[in-house]
């Protein structure tokens, strides 16, 4: 069979070879098609001008004035020309709809370095078959889970028309120290062949670099955290973010009731101030940053070491 | 060779109806469509409608919707046409002819209707 | 509806005369199809109408060569080369390009 494409609404026009130019003609039509229930005979003396269905011309062609999704399938013709000799046509009909211009909705206008993004959903409506949609970067395809790059993809069928709805949101994890102004574009390839892709305009998000946090630094006096019963231990937080941010202390994996400092006092050491301390660095454009835990213990006099179980001490140590 | 042969002529009353005949021979008569056509005496020709013999399909101009009834019997290769309600301006000659695909081809020789109190 | 508009309404020829008869079409009765549903018929005294021309300019079977049309859209003509006596009547365009189908209103044809 001969392959036909032929776009809905406008009108098909197949060729019955062998059949004579003008009337009258000795041919047959037949059609499986999904207006017909198996096949569908017409004649050419059937159908007038005024129809709007299938129809035979007076040069034997068949005629459909607006072709529709309902009219892909087999048609086949015989004819008998003046002579007696019989030909025999065959087409396999098969119907396309090119869909409006592809858009990117709900495109980002910044992304974050490091991290994954939504940069945007592009839609495409009216098409048949459905076809596909595929992303570009800087003009050259995404390939979906590769390098940070993720698609969901919908598509919906309308009850009526029959024509196709593509949906496809593109994620990505941009590279730290990659492009700042990436070109993102999508575009629609048909589901039949011999028809160019139709692009959407291109979006160009600015890539936002979060500084990279340098370490907190938890410095102790006296260092190493070993002190004698009664003296006083310094820990002091150290971040060099701009602006301060907010410090909290821990002791042994717990928050202290104290107030924001980035130094804490401990003044007249006993046995219940010993333990594990850290601080918290908390930034409005970060998360919190903990620092190293050191440890603060008390020595006994003459001795090079902390002990445990020493006596004395004031408890909860005191801020700058 | 293709023929129409009509009923013949009709005499009727103001209010009554008529129906005539069209017997096909020559063809298929599913095959093709059967229009009708009136010609008042001394006046031009006007478009009834039309009937698919094969399926009873019919399509009328609107100017006769209501005075005009097509049908046909396949069994008999017969086109029927009834005329209701009739009035002195129903009083013509009703062709029936065969449409060929493209134009119609063939014409009966006519039925005369005359509508007289 | 289509409206067809012959001219003129009488033709008084003589025999062997060329005689046109003209009608113009409200709207173009070109087809999507490519084809032109114009025809025409000639109707003698007391008998039917029978097909000269269909589709603008194809004679039907059985009719003489010296009955031709053209024309194209809205205006088509038909010409009879030499008149001969069995060609007098009334002669009708028709299409069947849109419903209702109409007829234009006759042109007689008659001797001098």
């Known amino acids: 069979a001969q392959n036909i494409t032929a776009r809905i609404g406008e009108p098909l026009v197949l060729k019955c070879k062998g059949a004579p130019k003008k009337p009258p003609q000795r041919l047959e039509w037949k059609l499986n098609t999904g207006r017909t229930e198996a096949w569908k005979v017409l004649s050419p003396q059937g159908g007038g001008p005024w129809d709007s269905v299938a129809r035979v011309l007076p040069n034997g062609s068949l005629f459909l004035p607006a072709v529709g999704i309902q009219d892909e399938g087999i048609f086949r013709c015989q004819a008998m020309n003046r002579n007696g000799k019989e030909t025999k046509s065959n087409y396999r009909v098969r119907v396309y709809q090119i869909p409006g211009k592809p858009e990117i909705v709900d495109s980002a206008s910044e992304l974050t370095a490091g991290v994954p993004n939504k940069v945007g959903t592009c839609v495409s409506e009216g098409s048949y078959p459905a076809g596909t949609l595929s992303w570009h970067l800087d003009g050259k395809p995404l390939v979906p889970n590769e390098k940070g790059v993720s698609v969901k993809e919908q598509t919906r069928r309308h009850p009526e028309t029959g024509l196709f709805t593509l949906q496809s949101e593109l994620m990505v994890t941009p590279a730290r120290g990659g492009d700042p102004r990436p070109t993102f574009s999508c575009s629609f390839s048909p589901g039949l062949p011999r028809h160019r892709a139709l692009r959407t305009a291109p979006i160009q998000p600015r890539v936002w670099e979060p500084v990279p946090l340098e370490e907190v630094q938890l410095v102790v006096e006296p260092e190493g955290g070993a002190v004698a019963p009664g003296g006083t231990v310094t820990l002091t937080c150290e971040v060099p973010a701009q602006p301060s941010p907010q410090i909290h202390w821990m002791k042994d994996g717990v928050p202290l009731p104290l107030p924001p400092s980035p130094v804490l006092i401990l003044p007249e050491i006993g046995p219940q101030d010993q333990g594990t301390y850290s601080c918290v660095a908390t930034h409005s454009s970060h998360g919190p940053q903990e620092s190293r835990a050191v440890s603060i213990s008390i020595i006994e006099p003459g001795e090079e070491g902390p002990t445990a179980g020493s006596v004395g001490g004031s408890g909860l140590g005191t801020l700058a | 060779q293709v023929q129409l042969q009509q009923s013949g002529a009709e005499l009727a009353k103001p209010g009554a109806s008529v129906k005539m005949s069209c017997k096909a021979s020559g063809y298929t008569f599913t095959t093709y469509w059967m229009h009708w056509v009136k010609q008042r005496p001394g006046q031009g020709l006007y478009w009834i409608g039309y009937i698919n013999p094969s399926t009873g399909y019919t399509e009328y101009n609107q100017k006769f919707k209501d005075k005009a009834t097509l049908t046909a019997d396949k069994s008999s290769s017969t086109a029927y046409m009834q005329l209701s309600s009739l009035t002195s301006e129903d009083s013509a000659v009703y062709y029936c002819a065969r449409w060929a695909g493209y134009t119609i081809d063939y014409w009966g020789q006519g039925t005369s209707v005359t509508v007289s109190s | 509806d289509v409206v067809l508009t012959q001219t003129p309404l009488s033709l008084p020829v003589n025999i062997g005369d060329q005689a046109s008869i003209s009608c113009k079409s409200t709207k173009s009765l070109l087809n999507s199809d490519g084809f032109t549903y114009l025809d025409w018929y000639l109707q003698k005294p007391g008998q039917s109408p029978q097909l000269l021309i269909y589709?603008?300019?194809d004679r039907f079977s059985g009719v003489p060569d010296r009955f031709s049309g053209s024309g194209s859209g809205t205006d088509f003509t038909l010409t009879i080369s030499r008149v001969e006596a069995e060609d007098l009547g009334v002669y009708y365009c028709?299409?069947?390009?849109?419903?209702?189908?109409?007829f234009g209103s006759g042109t007689k044809l008659e001797i001098k």
């Open positions: 589709l603008v300019s």
């Open positions: 028709f299409q069947s390009n849109s419903l209702p189908l109409t």
